[in-house]
């Protein structure tokens, strides 16, 4: 039985050229997290954090994705094309798979502020 919930940073905005932290948190379960996969809106993988082998940044993103904090991901040098959905997939034992969603809007405006608040999607 899957008792856990994924909390995410929800809908966030950030400035073009800036950086943003994508963060998910799994709570209300004692399940062991074996791996966390981070995917972009087109389902391409950005990064994997394996519990035993550590972080693995995909080649296409190696110059502008930084691991962390924690199981989160920092996306740097943002472009307008980065606007869209991001998904964290928690592979756990024995529960199975949990998935969280974040929507990132990259803004041209210099007054755009990075807003981040945890919410349950």
């Amino acid at each position: 039985m899957m008792t856990g919930t994924i909390e995410t940073t929800g809908n966030i905005s950030a400035k073009k050229g800036g950086s943003v932290i994508l963060q998910c948190h799994l709570s209300s379960t004692m399940a062991q997290v074996t791996q966390v996969n981070w995917e972009q809106h087109d389902h391409s993988l950005l990064a994997i954090r394996n519990a035993e082998l550590g972080w693995h940044i995909y080649p296409a993103f190696k110059d502008r994705v930084a691991p962390g904090p924690g199981l989160g991901l920092t996306l740097q040098s943002l472009t307008m094309n980065d606007t869209g959905e991001y998904f964290c997939t928690y592979h756990t034992y024995p529960d199975g798979t949990y998935r969280g969603r974040i929507f990132l809007e990259v803004l041209e405006s210099s007054v755009a502020e990075h807003s981040a608040r945890f919410q349950i999607p």
């Epitope: 993988l45 394996n50 082998l53």
Partner: antibody, heavy 123, light 109 residues
């Protein structure tokens, strides 16, 4: 489709270093989800995993061989290599390279293999 | 390390018969991490089954895998002449390290 090809000397003297290279064709070693591994098989015996490497250089090794093993990657040549130091006759085996799906979780396996290369350790 | 014990060591059967191969682990293995391979003389191993029960691409449906915990089974429902080979199970954990079983030879009776 992805193919792997081992290359290197077929004869190595005791106490020397065994060096092999695996060339990946039909796909990029920077595929992202895969590690790339080495497995060996002494004549008439079973399979023994040696170690595996990610395109970024991250590795994991068989603890029983770790002190003698170095696996490296050259993404510009789409190759990865094995070095095994201080070899003895017990290291005589067919050496295979293979694609390692350790990060695929429910598909963890070696799904593509090279044809293998026989390495004999003898003076 | 996790020791995988395969039995029997040799299985003598005729074409058309059913083959049942066993792989027993010294400690529990996630079924997601258990694979089976076929190896013919002078050839590299070929992946048959991953995740204990999923057939790899191009593998005929006469091959099936099952099991969980410490006991896993590879079944060949009706042996074809090309199925006579050595079969290895493998567990793909990182710590303890991944290991292969000692193999089961399926030979023509």
């Amino acid at each position: 489709q992805v193919q792997l090809q081992e290359s290197g000397p077929g004869l190595v003297k005791p106490s020397q270093t065994l060096s092999l290279t695996c060339t990946v064709s039909g796909g990029s070693i920077e595929s992202g989800v895969y590690y790339w591994g080495w497995i060996r098989q002494p004549p008439g015996k079973g399979l023994e995993w040696i170690g595996s490497i990610y395109y970024s250089g991250s590795t994991y090794y068989n603890p029983s061989l770790k002190s003698r093993v170095t696996i490296s990657v050259d993404t510009s040549k789409n190759q990865f290599s094995l070095k095994l130091s201080s070899v003895t006759a017990a290291d005589t085996a067919v050496y295979y390279c293979a694609r390692d799906g350790v990060l695929t979780l429910n598909k963890r396996s070696f799904d593509i293999w090279g044809q293998g290369t026989m390495v004999t350790v003898s003076s | 390390e996790i020791v995988l014990t395969q039995s029997p060591g040799t299985l003598s059967l005729s074409p058309g018969e059913r083959a049942t191969l066993s792989c027993r682990a010294s400690q529990s293995v996630s079924s997601s991490y258990l694979a089976w391979y076929q190896q013919k003389p002078g050839q590299a191993p070929r992946l048959l089954i991953y995740g204990a029960s999923s057939r790899a691409t191009g593998i005929p449906d006469r091959f099936s895998g099952s099991g969980s915990g410490t006991d896993f089974t590879l079944t060949i429902s009706r042996l074809e002449p090309e199925d006579f080979a050595v079969y290895y199970c493998q567990q793909h954990t990182v710590r303890p390290p991944l290991t292969f079983g000692g193999g089961t030879k399926v030979e023509i009776k």
